[in-house]
Interface confidence: low
């Protein structure tokens, strides 16, 4: 946390984009190139984040805000503020140390990221399997076998695919 500055503190007058320069009798100096201060009253400017390697620049650094990075095509962000990039895989796969591998039987992944998760066990809810699972899709559960009277028909809706970008970050 930052202690509340006294009313006498000349640094409190320095706006975002500047710093209170102790070497110059506490006047407000603009942040040097490739640095920023997002709040007023700062005694130093922070170095701008550089989006290098697998990171690419989503938003350039300005004197008042840090750069924001995302990942190059074929990779997606992980962690707060896109602190890491992880390789994309296809649906029906997960990333392992040896690269993208197909989901094992009984598991699925409907996204380009994340891990293969087990198919829903319909019987735990007293239901039956209406549509079998695949590597890319979960099973679709339907009414319990007892609920299906002879002659009754059911229309199987497709398993809903989650929108990309809604998986763990």
């Amino acid at each position: 946390f930052e202690r509340t500055r006294s009313l006498q503190d000349p640094c409190s007058n320095c706006p975002a984009g500047t710093f209170c320069d102790n070497n110059r009798n506490q006047i407000c100096s603009p942040c040097p190139p490739n640095s920023f201060s997002s709040a007023g009253g700062q005694r130093t400017c922070d170095i701008c984040r550089q989006c290098k390697g697998v990171f690419r620049t989503r938003k350039e650094c300005s004197s008042t805000s840090n750069a924001e990075c995302d990942c190059t095509p074929g990779f997606h962000c992980l962690g707060a503020g896109c602190s890491m990039c992880e390789q994309d895989c296809k649906q029906g796969q997960e990333l392992t140390k040896k690269g993208c591998k197909d989901c094992c039987f009984g598991t699925f992944n409907d996204q380009k990221r994340g891990i293969c998760r087990p198919w829903t066990n319909c019987s735990l809810d007293g239901k039956s399997v209406l549509v079998n699972g695949t590597k890319e899709r979960d099973v679709v559960c339907g009414p319990s076998p007892a609920d299906l009277s002879p002659g009754a028909s059911s229309v199987t809706p497709p398993a809903p695919a989650r929108e990309p970008g809604h998986s763990p970050q």
């Epitope: 390697g53 992980l78 962690g79 602190s83 890491m84 990333l95 140390k97 891990i115």
Partner: antibody, heavy 121, light 107 residues
């Protein structure tokens, strides 16, 4: 085989700085993050930061951001961690450890033997 | 930062006994959790990553479970060589943060 060999123990005065080294061998140095983790005597583990040798991209734990500098020398496959403004509570064993390139499955699979830093007046 | 609360801080169990250690995250960390074993004077060793995946070469008596905020490390049958301190680590967000550790001793 993969090895991370760290520099020897250090005794430092409060207010001074220490620079530790971690020499990697047995793998492609550029393709793994080097992390620094410390452990005070009888205490738990604390991540300090990491560096990606290929382009020297760094992430720092905000707790240490103003006092820690991570660097690498690719020509010797060596990572360095400098900690400044030392205080007695920085007395700890400092480990370097690696994690794989892009796949952020943070398995610290190989560790250095650790360097004991003692800060005492 | 994400806080990791590990319990118990220490435990004493008999050889062959089942041992359970829990770790609770201050927010949802998906399955981005690993478990480490540390013996005195040694560097930690990874046992499990992604909450439930055993690292190659780790005995199958070790297992991990959980997702979201609550995670468990289980040793199905405690062996003498399992005497150590165990740490959980979240790596869903930087900075990665460790639990406080659980010291496992023989009764």
């Amino acid at each position: 085989q993969v090895q991370l060999v760290q520099s020897g123990a250090e005794v430092k005065k409060p207010g001074s700085s220490v620079k530790l080294s971690c020499k990697a061998s047995g793998y492609t140095f550029s393709s793994y993050w080097i992390n620094w983790v410390r452990q005070a005597p009888g205490q738990g583990l604390e991540w300090m930061g990491n560096i990606y040798p290929s382009d020297s991209y760094t992430n720092y734990n905000q707790k240490f951001k103003d006092r820690v500098t991570l660097t690498v020398d690719k020509s010797t496959s060596t990572a360095y961690m400098e900690l400044s403004s030392l205080r007695s509570e920085d007395t700890a064993v400092y480990y370097c450890t690696r994690t794989w390139e892009f796949y952020y499955d943070s398995v610290f699979d190989y560790w250095g033997q650790g360097t004991l830093v003692t800060v005492s007046s | 930062d994400i806080q990791m609360t590990q319990s118990p801080s220490s435990l004493s169990a008999s050889l062959g006994e089942r041992v359970t250690i829990t770790c609770k995250a201050s927010q949802d960390i998906n399955s981005y959790l690993s478990w480490y074993q540390q013996k005195p004077g040694k560097a930690p060793k990874t046992l499990i990553y992604r909450a439930n995946r055993l690292v190659d070469g780790v005995p199958s008596r070790f297992s991990g479970s959980g997702s979201g905020q609550d995670f468990t490390l289980t040793i199905s049958s405690l062996q003498p060589e399992d005497i150590a301190t165990y740490y959980c680590l979240q790596y869903d967000e930087l900075p990665p943060t460790f639990g406080g550790g659980t010291k496992v001793e023989i009764k």
